[in-house]
């Protein structure tokens, strides 16, 4: 819980952060490096065929608190990790897919023809 009077808005970094980007490189990235006022991230998720896909890149300060919180999404296996401690810190992030729930075997993409 936030203390009274404490801002819920994330604090702006005094300087730009460079991150590795893969499958998630914006137009202003160069040599698979993007820049941000927020966080670097690495994410793993299943595509439509159930294959794990890893993406990485930059998250802007706006909304990044929510995006980095890794809130579970029904019927979607996904995990995200964020960092800010140094440039390209997301090279060292290795999120893993959450374990399959029993329900996922029934409802999951495996059974879609």
């Amino acid at each position: 819980k936030k203390e009274d009077g404490e801002s819920t808005a994330p604090t702006a970094r005094p300087k730009v952060l460079r991150c590795k980007c893969h499958h998630h490189c914006p137009e202003d990235s160069v040599n698979n490096i993007c820049s941000t006022d927020g966080y670097c991230f690495t994410m793993i998720e299943e595509d439509d065929s159930g294959t794990p896909v890893v993406t990485s890149g930059c998250l802007g300060l706006e909304g990044s608190d929510f995006q980095c919180r890794d809130t579970p999404i029904p019927h979607q296996r996904r995990s995200i990790e964020c960092c800010t401690e140094r440039n390209e810190c997301n090279k060292d992030l290795h999120p893993t897919l959450p374990p399959l729930k029993d329900r996922d075997f029934v409802d999951g993409p495996i059974h879609h023809k």
Partner: antibody, heavy 116, light 112 residues
Framework: QVQLLQPGAELVKPGSSVKVSCKAS????????MQWVKQRPGQGLEWIGE????????LYNQKFKGKATLTVDTSSSTAYMQLSSLTSEDSAVYYC?????????WGQGTTLTVSS | DVVMTQTPLSLPVSLGDQASISCRSS???????????FHWYLQKPGQSPELLIY???NRFSGVPDRFRGSGSGTDFTLKISRVEAEDLGVYFC?????????FGSGTKLEIK
């Protein structure tokens, strides 16, 4: 107040190398990037590259890769730019500049003269 | 590389006049974070550049309010409402959205 102190001038011979210094004060050195910019008379300003003193991460303008090497000494809050294989084309004023998301403070510049 | 085209190259003015300098970039300067990293600097004779305006329209500390920056995307303008003697020098536009960062070729503000 923020200050970036550079030597006023360097005179060097063609083919040699030079290491230009930039001593920062008035702020936390590791909280900002340090950039280096070249200015030749009538040629405008050219971005050489930048270094993050907190982790020594560097980014270079492709044009200056192999020419410039950026380093820092955090214990003395000093940034360095080494220029190698000097020619008359490297004669210019070189500025260090503090960078967060834009350059807000510049050093006074070091005039490099390459001459035999 | 992003090319920054500044006009005019030379701007003769009388003290007290309004001055206007334009800068156009070869591609949009809107960063993926939504910020536009476009800035204006003034280099007075024999000195290093100094920051006037950052992120299109924000005056840096100590910069008089006669300096106004505006624009978006690829087209930007610096207006000086009443030119004073201390405003003379070369004005540079700059972008830090795309690596390598680039500068305009400069506009020399001089007395008519």
């Amino acid at each position: 107040q923020v200050q970036l102190l550079q030597p006023g001038a360097e005179l060097v011979k063609p083919g040699s190398s030079v290491k230009v210094s930039c001593k920062a004060s008035g702020y936390t050195f590791t909280n900002y990037w340090m950039q280096w910019v070249k200015q030749r008379p009538g040629q405008g300003l050219e971005w050489i590259g930048e270094i993050d003193p907190s982790d020594t991460y560097t980014l270079y303008n492709q044009k200056f890769k192999g020419k410039a090497t950026l380093t820092v000494d955090t214990s003395s809050s000093t940034a360095y730019m080494q220029l190698s294989s000097l020619t008359s084309e490297d004669s210019a004023v070189y500025y260090c500049a503090r960078f967060g998301y834009y350059v807000d403070y510049w050093g006074q510049g070091t005039t490099l003269t390459v001459s035999s | 590389d992003v090319v920054m085209t500044q006009t005019p190259l030379s701007l003769p003015v009388s003290l007290g006049d309004q001055a206007s300098i334009s800068c156009r970039s070869s591609q949009s300067l809107v960063h993926s974070t939504g910020n536009t990293y476009f800035h204006w600097y003034l280099q007075k004779p024999g000195q290093s550049p100094e920051l006037l305006i950052y992120k299109v329209s924000n005056r840096f500390s100590g910069v008089p309010d006669r300096f106004r920056g505006s624009g978006s995307g690829t087209d930007f303008t610096l207006k000086i409402s009443r030119v004073e003697a201390e405003d003379l020098g070369v004005y540079f536009c700059s972008q830090s959205t795309h690596v390598p960062f680039t500068f305009g070729s400069g506009t020399k503000l001089e007395i008519k």
